[in-house]
Interface confidence: low
Amino acid sequence: IVKAGIAIPRNSGCPNSEDKNFPRTVMVNLNIHNRNTSTNPKRSSDYYNRSTSPWNLHRNEDPERYPSVIWEAKCRHLGCVKADGNVDYHMNSVPIQQEILVLRREPRHCPNSFRLEKILVSVGCTCVTPIVHHVA
Amino acid sequence: IVKAGIAIPRNSGCPNSEDKNFPRTVMVNLNIHNRNTSTNPKRSSDYYNRSTSPWNLHRNEDPERYPSVIWEAKCRHLGCVKADGNVDYHMNSVPIQQEILVLRREPRHCPNSFRLEKILVSVGCTCVTPIVHHVA
């Protein structure tokens, strides 16, 4: 049933999904509806290399979470890449972060009960002017 | 129960959350656990202005979705901002997009049944070198 990449045996300590007193719960259909025609836009996927603030993508895997795999961006440089290919350290490459919703198995290993969780992920990098404090 | 910012009356056509035959469903506790101590980092939120590929944030609201409010980034310029404040059109500001999970009320207006949905959102913008096609 659960599309979290693993098959987990039913745990006798798991809450009953038919329990009316289950705290603050709703039924969620995991048959995902995808509103995007392309799930992994190639055009976005090469920005990490073409950006003036390029980044690497690191795989973050957690079988107790849905989705179990999340890709985290890590800026390659402290500075930003100039047209000549050199790094300009008067600018900073910084991660653009976003809070996303994931489902966390709770209690752990239960195949049919989750808690909604917010996590902060780095999606890519952008080049910013550093904060400069002028001394009077 | 549902933290979607609206109170929706119970619809007689809603599936019963105790129904064992509810398709591919799990119980989800909506009492969100936030793994981040700060939900709206000031540091991230001023990048939209300091970036060489600055962006504006547009509010996307949908009461049938959880979260009901999502902020979408729209790049301000086609090009990228240079140190002198002018726009360099030899470079491109592009949106960094990420697929996120949201909960969509299904059937509509039901307070306790959702379908997991993937949507593509623009989180911010980055400055990239355009793809140049050389004609032989």
Epitope: R76, P130 | S38, P41
Partner: antibody
Framework: EVQLVESGGGLVQPGRSLRLSCAAS????????MHWVRQAPGKGLEWVSG????????GYADSVKGRFTISRDNAKNSLYLQMNSLRAEDTALYYC????????????????WGQGTTVTVSS | EIVLTQSPATLSLSPGERATLSCRAS??????LAWYQQKPGQAPRLLIY???NRATGIPARFSGSGSGTDFTLTISSLEPEDFAVYYC?????????FGQGTKLEIK
């Protein structure tokens, strides 16, 4: 002058707690991530913990995870390290260090260091 | 975690000579490598970041090179104040790790 001054070290028995403080001056504290790095007597450097500008991202070395807690008070320009369940192997000189990037996030290259405060765990 | 191995453990040279210190990573760290100098009784001092960039106020005789797994810190002409312990540090993978250090001593 950019300066970091650590305090709070001392002699403590195994299993007890200690709280280190680091007072920052000469720079805008909340523009930078901060770190604690330690050095056992006669040994090399070991990164202990780091915290980004707004406490939204926090990290610990495996050796201290679950026992140490890093925090910061931007209004007071101060960084803290709460050390619980101390062990003999925690004996070290503890340095407070400033991250290099004025972006508030982690880069882990540290360009300003305090002089350190000594923690000795012994019965 | 990534292990950084520095060599040699001790380097004995005279003022005016060229010093070459090595740092090898157990896996690629791209260019995410920094070098620090530490003198007895003092805090470490950042010399080089991102493998080859001198930190503010660092003399031009210090230079860094390398990428991937092999890195070098070069001091072109040793000054008396350069004799100290030098550490490399990677920020490519969590947690950030330091090498065990190279002691540069006067011959």
């Amino acid at each position: 002058e950019v300066q970091l001054v650590e305090s709070g070290g001392g002699l403590v028995q195994p299993g007890r707690s200690l709280r280190l403080s680091c007072a920052a001056s000469g720079f805008t504290f909340d523009d930078f991530a901060m770190h604690w790095v330690r050095q056992a007597p006669g040994k090399g450097l070991e990164w202990v913990s780091g915290i980004n500008w707004n406490s939204g991202s926090i990290g610990y070395a495996d050796s201290v995870k679950g026992r140490f807690t890093i925090s910061r008070d931007n209004a007071k320009n101060s960084l803290y390290l709460q050390m619980n369940s101390l062990r003999a192997e925690d004996t070290a000189l503890y340095y407070c260090a400033k991250d290099i990037a004025a972006a508030g996030e982690f880069y882990f290259d540290m360009d300003v260091w305090g002089q350190g405060t000594t923690v000795t765990v012994s019965s | 975690e990534i292990v950084l191995t520095q060599s040699p453990a001790t380097l004995s040279l005279s003022p005016g000579e060229r010093a070459t210190l090595s740092c090898r990573a157990s896996q690629s760290v791209s260019s995410y490598l920094a070098w620090y100098q530490q003198k007895p009784g003092q805090a470490p001092r950042l010399l080089i970041y991102d493998a080859s960039n001198r930190a503010t106020g660092i003399p031009a005789r210090f230079s860094g090179s390398g990428s991937g797994t092999d890195f070098t810190l070069t001091i072109s002409s040793l000054e008396p104040e350069d004799f100290a312990v030098y550490y490399c540090q990677q920020r490519s993978n969590w947690p950030p790790t330091f090498g065990q250090g190279t002691k540069l001593e006067i011959k």
